[in-house]
Interface confidence: medium
């Protein structure tokens, strides 16, 4: 007897982080034997949507013409072949930005920092939030979460980096969010350019948690100091 049908692949174009009002297409790719594709959204009645396969039948398209809060969430897809339904795909997390006003990102004491010194990136929101995210452009593991204990409402999160090396240089943005839906983010902050001066032969900081071996130097997650920040926010790696 044949084993279970292989799970399909699920992805979003142009990406899984979409601004409010923009269009997004969710693709589910199975096999040439697929007769039907089904998309399920977590905490929504199943199926969330069904589509016939596009020729040559190995994938289906689920279109969202205008992104809103209702579409943000966690999705899985399946396909049906003559022998039954496939295993579920790995989940796709569709995140909407623009749910809240943009925070402000600043560097203390300065965005110009000498290698080996310390800098703190400060993300401030005008409304109290319980989750803050710091994103570095062009990083494979860009997200660093700070989530407050017990849902405390904070107006800022501190992302300390020490010692700073050339790896930390680059462009950062931050987002704020409420814990009740981490699929809804604020508008992004204006970008902050962190410029690290000093020797290019600085020793690489060792990550506080292991990262994918496929990650290159620019793909390392941020390395903040310490395990628990002072602000009552708990750190989560993504």
């Amino acid at each position: 007897q044949a084993g279970p049908l292989p799970k399909p692949t699920l992805w979003a174009e142009p990406g899984s982080v979409i601004s409010w009002g923009n269009s997004v297409t969710i693709w589910c790719q199975g096999t040439l034997e697929a007769r039907e594709y089904r998309l399920d959204k977590e905490e929504s009645p199943a199926p969330w949507d069904r589509q016939n396969p596009l020729e040559p039948k190995n994938k289906a398209r689920f279109s969202i013409p205008s992104m809103t809060e209702d579409y943000a969430g966690r999705y899985r897809c399946y396909y049906r072949s003559p022998v039954g339904w496939s295993q579920p795909s790995d989940p796709l997390e569709l995140v909407m930005t623009g749910a809240y006003s943009k925070p402000t990102l600043s560097a203390l004491p300065s965005p110009l920092v000498t290698s080996g010194k310390s800098v703190t990136l400060l993300c401030q929101s005008r409304s109290p939030m319980d989750t803050f995210l710091l994103i570095k452009e062009r990083a494979a593991h860009p997200l660093l979460h700070l989530r407050s204990e017990h849902g405390a409402q904070q107006h800022q999160a501190e992302f300390p980096m020490s010692p700073v090396t050339s790896v930390h240089g680059g462009t950062y943005r931050c987002f704020s969010s409420h814990g009740f839906s981490h699929y809804l983010l604020s508008h992004p902050s204006d970008p902050l350019e962190l410029i690290v001066s000093g020797s290019l032969e600085d020793p690489r900081p060792s990550p506080t948690r292991s990262v994918s071996t496929a990650a290159g130097p620019e793909d390392q997650p941020l390395m903040p100091t310490g395990s628990v920040p002072h602000s009552g926010l708990r750190r989560h790696w993504e």
């Epitope: 402000t104 400060l122 005008r126 409304s127 904070q154 107006h155 501190e158 602000s231």
Partner: antibody, heavy 121, light 107 residues
């Protein structure tokens, strides 16, 4: 010129409800955040809550069950209601405005002159 | 809630003297601290916002500094009109809380 003016009854009985109005001029409530702050005589100020047209209301959790803040942007007014009054609610009640529309720092940059509320038993 | 403590409770200064007022937060509040001056019968007046920025019209003898949980307000040359009570305020987390105040008196 930025102006805030509080109005309401000077004397309220314990267990009753206090209703105060903050009437603003020189700026729009759709652009700025307005906070309510009170100060018992001889003591430090205490933040009560805030009204922000596009970002909702935030309350001091210790008073949240007794507080309600609302606004009428067309009349340039923000309202505070506090029920189940106690004698220790006596003090001067102020409304304040933040420094700029970004609303990140300097939240109590402009203050009204305050209105004295006495809660009698 | 974040508790703000101020020291000293009161201090006496001579005209022209330099004084430093301290404010400590029970947890980090970033730079979300303002300083206010209140004179008898008046509403509090914003001096410093965001830890270190002087509000419009505030003389440059007032300087604020600090980050995280420790903050200071320095008055470099005390003038007679500086007398009153100084409060720090944190708005890093809800509820926003004031310190108990430092009373500045004339020697």
């Amino acid at each position: 010129q930025v102006q805030l003016k509080e109005s309401g009854p000077g004397l309220v009985q314990a267990s009753e409800t206090l209703s105060l109005t903050c009437t603003v001029s020189g700026f729009s409530l759709t652009s700025y955040c307005v906070n309510w702050v009170r100060q018992p005589s001889g003591k430090g100020p205490e933040w009560l809550g805030r009204f922000w047209y596009d970002e909702g209301k935030v309350y001091n959790l210790t008073l949240e069950s007794r507080l309600s803040i609302s606004g009428d942007t067309s009349k340039n007014q923000v309202f505070l209601k506090m029920n189940r009054l106690r004698t220790d609610d006596t003090g001067t009640y102020y409304c304040t405005r933040d420094r700029d529309t970004l609303g990140i720092t300097g939240w109590f940059a402009y203050w009204g002159q305050g209105t004295l509320v006495t809660v009698s038993s | 809630e974040t508790v703000m403590t101020q020291s000293p409770t009161s201090l006496s200064a001579s005209i022209g003297e330099r004084v430093t007022l301290n404010c400590k937060a029970s947890q980090s509040v970033g730079i979300n601290v303002d300083w206010y001056q209140q004179t008898p019968g008046q509403s509090p007046k914003l001096l410093i916002y965001g830890s270190a920025n002087r509000h419009t019209g505030v003389p440059d003898r007032f300087t604020g500094s600090g980050f995280g949980s420790g903050f200071t307000l320095t008055i470099s040359n005390v003038e007679p009109e500086d007398l009153g009570v100084y409060y720090c305020l944190q708005y890093g987390s809800v509820p926003y809380t004031f310190g108990p105040g430092t009373k500045l008196e004339l020697k």
